[in-house]
Every structure is written in structure tokens, then in C-alpha cells.
Amino acid sequence: LSVQQGPNLLQVRQGSQATLVCQVDQATAWERLRVKWTKDGAILCQPYITNGSLSLGVCGPQGRLSWQAPSHLTLQLDPVSLNHSGAYVCWAAVEIPELEEAEGNITRLFVDPDDPTQNRNRIASFPG
């Protein structure tokens, strides 16, 4: 089981949207995938994916989850608030036939205040 997460760094303006992507790769077929998104070490949500279906659509404040088979889990924050700034990690596990767990590298989200006098560019860098 491996998890690739992106982007590494994401800078957005308050009130806009931020999209974090988690790619879960498993060599063998799985029946149930458990995933967690954490922010600064605290669990935002922990849905299950069975038969290509997410058990949960909400993930933390203003967070929406989506699953694109075979491997892409997306967390969309919309609208983004200053409180969304932090370090996000995607974790995944399968229990069958053996317990396997993996987590992605950190996505650091920076949220700029909605202040027209601060004209900073958005940054989005993906691994690789």
C-alpha cells in the first residue's frame, strides 16, 4: 500500500477554494479502504470506501470529499478560511488479507487574508 499526496505546498486566498489530492495505490485488490485526513495531527474525517463508494462526504469545516476510482481521494475546502491553514496528511489502510497502512507526505496549506493590499501569488507545488 502506498499513498502519494499533493501538492506539497498550497497558498490560497481566504474565501477561495483549495484542493488536496491523495492517490492510494495497492498492488492487490481491496474490498474496503479506510482513509483519514488529518490537519495538524488531528483527525478531520475517516471515511470508508467500499465498492467504489465513500461512506462520508464531509470532512472537517467546509471540507468535501470525493473518490475517483481506482485511486484518487480529493479533499476540497470551499470556501477557505484562515483557520484552514495548517499541515494536512492523508492516511490509508486495508485490513484484508493483512493490515497495511500508509500515509502521504504533508501538504502545507497557507491561507492569505482577503486583503487587496496584499498581492501575493498563489503557490501550488506537487511532488516530482
Epitope: E31, R32, K36, G41, Y48, S55, L99
Partner: antibody, heavy 120, light 107 residues
Framework: QVQLQESGPGLVKPSQTLSLTCTVT?????????WNWLRQHPGKGLEWIGY???????SYNPSHKSRVTISRDTSKNQFFLKLSSVTAADTAVYYC?????????????WGQGTTVTVSS | DIQLTQSPSFLSASVGDRVTITCKAS??????VAWYQQKPGKAPKLLIY???TRHTGVPSRFSGSGSGTDFTLTISSLQPEDFATYYC?????????FGGGTKVEIK
């Protein structure tokens, strides 16, 4: 309404294999859910042993993995627990229970429990 | 394994009392916590899952709250049939584990 009923010998000798059956009525074990075994030592808390899911795949508590097998007979709508090389520490009330495999692992339906004593 | 510590382990209360039982997890479990009621010689019954969702048919006097590591089961007005032992369970980390139980007895 789903009902679960455990059955099996109440007395097992040390080093032997404990075998229990859970018979499910009112719901097909192949339709959905995970079908669990748990136990409760006398006067103590609950311990999850493992499950077999609706698709027939099993998952076990690592603490007992080397000794546990959970299987099923879909024609009889039953699932089974085998625990090998038992000792007195395996004396407990054993429960079968159903959990929502697609949404959470809370146990929403239980059997009444069966007491197993390991003694020579 | 994730450890769940319940407190108190024993509680003496009267009919009509408000009762609060706490469950502390050894690590963050989000809201993946369930609560059960067990009476002597009987199987546990599910009361609450996902920390705060009442199971079908459970009276509204039972409520659950909390997230992360600290969880609470509250019985707003204790009824005679509520004297029992209560357990929390986490389903965030594998294997699923239970708290040691809180026995609620008649004062």
C-alpha cells in the same frame, strides 16, 4: 429482524481447539455487514477477536491471529470461530455480532453469548 | 493498540439523576467511538455510534459527545432500566478496542 445465536461446547480441554457456530436468521450474511466474534472474560471488558465480511474475507485481532480462524457456511447462513491451543486464559463468554462494514465498526446486533470454560 | 480509559469505573446514582461517563483514548480517534449498555447475563446493546449518533430506538435521554481523545456519554435523567454497565469502543484504529466499563448502580 436479524437474530444471532451462538452454539458450541461449553467445556474445552487445554491445548484443544475451541469451535463455535453463530447462526444468523432474518438476514443473509452474504448481503452486507461484517460478522464478528468477540469475547468477555469473567467480570471483565470486551475484546474483539475478528470478523468475516459479507464477501467472505476475514480479518483478525493481531493478538490472536496465529490461533484464530473465522469461516462461514453460506448455505446455512452460519459463521464459525476456531481458536486453537486454548488455555485457561481463553475461558470467557463468546459473542457473535454484526457490524456495519460500509460505514462504521459499531456492533448493532448481538447474540446472547455462550460461556466457554477451558479446563481439564 | 489504542487504549480506552473509562471513568469512573463505578458510579452510584438515583433515578432522575444526570449521569456522565467519560472515555479517554490513548490517541486521536476522531469521532470513531461507539457506546454500549450491558446488563448482567446479557449481550451488550449499541446506544451511540460516531460519538454522537443515537442508534435506532435508543431513548433521547442518552447522548454522546466528544472528538479526538475525550468522549462523554450522558444520561440526562436516569431511569430504573438504565442501571447497567456501559462500554465505549473505538473503531478508528485496528484492532477495535473497548474501554474497561462503567457500572452504574442504584444509590
Amino acid at each position: 429482524q436479524v437474530q444471532l445465536q451462538e452454539s458450541g461446547p461449553g467445556l474445552v480441554k487445554p491445548s484443544q481447539t475451541l469451535s463455535l457456530t453463530c447462526t444468523v436468521t432474518g438476514y443473509s450474511i452474504t448481503s452486507d455487514f461484517a460478522w464478528n466474534w468477540l469475547r468477555q472474560h469473567p467480570g471483565k471488558g470486551l475484546e474483539w477477536i475478528g470478523y468475516i465480511n459479507y464477501a467472505g474475507s476475514s480479518s483478525y485481532n493481531p493478538s490472536h491471529k496465529s490461533r484464530v480462524t473465522i469461516s462461514r457456511d453460506t448455505s446455512k447462513n452460519q459463521f464459525f470461530l476456531k481458536l486453537s491451543s486454548v488455555t485457561a486464559a481463553d475461558t470467557a463468554v463468546y459473542y457473535c455480532a454484526r457490524s456495519n462494514y460500509r460505514n462504521d465498526d459499531a456492533m448493532d446486533s448481538w447474540g446472547q453469548g455462550t460461556t466457554v470454560t477451558v479446563s481439564s | 493498540d489504542i487504549q480506552l480509559t473509562q471513568s469512573p469505573s463505578f458510579l452510584s446514582a438515583s433515578v432522575g439523576d444526570r449521569v456522565t461517563i467519560t472515555c479517554k483514548a490513548s490517541q486521536d480517534v476522531g469521532t470513531a467511538v461507539a457506546w454500549y449498555q450491558q446488563k448482567p447475563g446479557k449481550a451488550p446493546k449499541l446506544l451511540i455510534y460516531w460519538a454522537s449518533t443515537r442508534h435506532t430506538g435508543v431513548p433521547s435521554r442518552f447522548s454522546g459527545s466528544g472528538s479526538g481523545t475525550d468522549f462523554t456519554l450522558t444520561i440526562s435523567s436516569l431511569q430504573p432500566e438504565d442501571f447497567a454497565t456501559y462500554y465505549c469502543q473505538q473503531f478508528s484504529g485496528f484492532p477495535w478496542t473497548f474501554g474497561g466499563g462503567t457500572k452504574v448502580e442504584i444509590k
